[in-house]
């Protein structure tokens, strides 16, 4: 069976301050079982943007019903974008465990923030 891939089709997205940004992510397999997390940046300084499993992420909504077991679309919308939101966003698949372990990351989508039109 082909190994799961994390696909982020957009290399970059540009959004005006105050608007919402949609970041696309799909996976190619339901295996291994485990949650998706979104991060801004890579490495130890990365910021957790969304965790499918736990936490409250008020500016983030999932584009599809990510809680459905057969779902493979983990795209998100981030509302009320500010300059501090600019950066590269990674959709990351985790393998279920205690604790969950990182399995595979998407290639990233760079979000740039334009000045709010006056």
């Amino acid at each position: 069976e082909e190994e799961l891939q994390v696909i982020q089709p957009d290399k970059s997205v540009s959004v005006a301050a105050g608007e919402s940004a949609i970041l696309h992510c799909t996976v190619t397999s339901l295996i291994p079982v485990g949650p998706i997390q979104w991060f801004r940046g890579a490495g130890p300084a990365r910021e957790l943007i969304y965790n499918q499993k736990e936490g409250h992420f008020p500016r983030v909504t999932t584009v599809s019903e990510s809680t459905k077991r057969e779902n493979m679309d983990f795209s998100i919308s981030i509302s009320n974008i500010t300059p501090a939101d600019a950066g590269t966003y990674y959709c990351v698949k985790f393998r279920k465990g205690s604790p969950d372990t990182e399995f595979k990351s998407g290639a990233g989508t760079e979000l740039s923030v334009r000045a709010k039109p006056s």
Epitope: G41, E47, I49, P58, R59, N80, P83, A84, K116
Partner: antibody, heavy 119, light 108 residues
Framework: DVQLVESGGGVVRPGESLRLSCAAS????????MNWVRQAPGEGLEWVSR????????DYADSVKGRFTISRDNSKNTLYLQMNSLRAEDTAVYYC????????????WGLGALVTVSS | ETVLTQSPATLSVSPGERATLSCRAS??????LAWHQQKPGQAPRLLIY???NRATGIPDRFSGSGSGTDFTLTISSPQTEDSAVYYC??????????FGGGTKVEIK
């Protein structure tokens, strides 16, 4: 209910060190960035430091850079502030504060820990 | 760095008399402004976020408005328990996170 409880405050001499702790409960601690904010006697609020949810990303106010170190232990739901080379002007009540999300305001505050630096 | 200037420094009002507090940013912060209340001897408490949204459990006599650089916190009918210092906080540009200098509200 979200609870943040600071401990470790006290009286120290200039040049000495102190470590503050903030015990968190009532929320998924490992999912949120955390901050330290201080308030000198009779003064306003001054942001001191921030740490991201995983603990690998930190930011500091210029006034404490190189002297203070923020850290966290997500397995213990605890936030720390290691304060070295303390100065009289570091005398303040130190509050830990939870962020609403990674790029946002502070939605919950601890009760504070008093740090007094005096010779 | 964005500087937040609050005015007036002190505001004295009678119970039931509208109180209006101002916070001005040195550059636009969009709607990314919060208000915190700090009563004497207590920790700060979040009142308003995103300029106009009341935090959980905050009475509706507190309201926030504004965007860009000029923001207002209004206490429509102040109660004696509203005596406190009120701080604005911006989170549009960071670090550092910035607070205003505070407005002390006294209820006569």
């Amino acid at each position: 209910d979200v609870q943040l409880v600071e401990s470790g405050g006290g009286v120290v001499r200039p040049g000495e060190s102190l470590r503050l702790s903030c015990a968190a409960s009532g929320f998924s601690f490992r999912s949120y960035a955390m901050n330290w904010v201080r308030q000198a006697p009779g003064e306003g609020l001054e942001w001191v430091s921030r740490i991201n949810s995983g603990g690998g990303g930190t930011d500091y106010a210029d006034s404490v850079k190189g002297r203070f170190t923020i850290s966290r232990d997500n397995s213990k739901n605890t936030l720390y502030l290691q304060m070295n080379s303390l100065r009289a002007e570091d005398t303040a009540v130190y509050y830990c504060a939870k962020q609403y999300d990674w790029n946002s305001f502070f939605d919950y505050w601890g009760l504070g820990a008093l740090v007094t630096v005096s010779s | 760095e964005t500087v937040l200037t609050q005015s007036p420094a002190t505001l004295s009002v009678s119970p039931g008399e509208r109180a209006t507090l101002s916070c001005r940013a040195s550059q636009t912060v969009g709607s990314k402004l919060a208000w915190h209340q700090q009563k004497p001897g207590q920790a700060p408490r979040l009142l308003i976020y995103d300029a106009s949204n009341r935090a959980t459990g905050i009475p509706d006599r507190f309201s926030g408005s504004g965007s860009g650089t000029d923001f207002t916190l209004t206490i429509s009918s102040p109660q004696t328990e509203d005596s406190a210092v009120y701080y604005c906080q911006q989170y549009y540009y960071w670090p550092p996170y910035r607070f205003g200098g505070g407005t002390k509200v006294e209820i006569k």
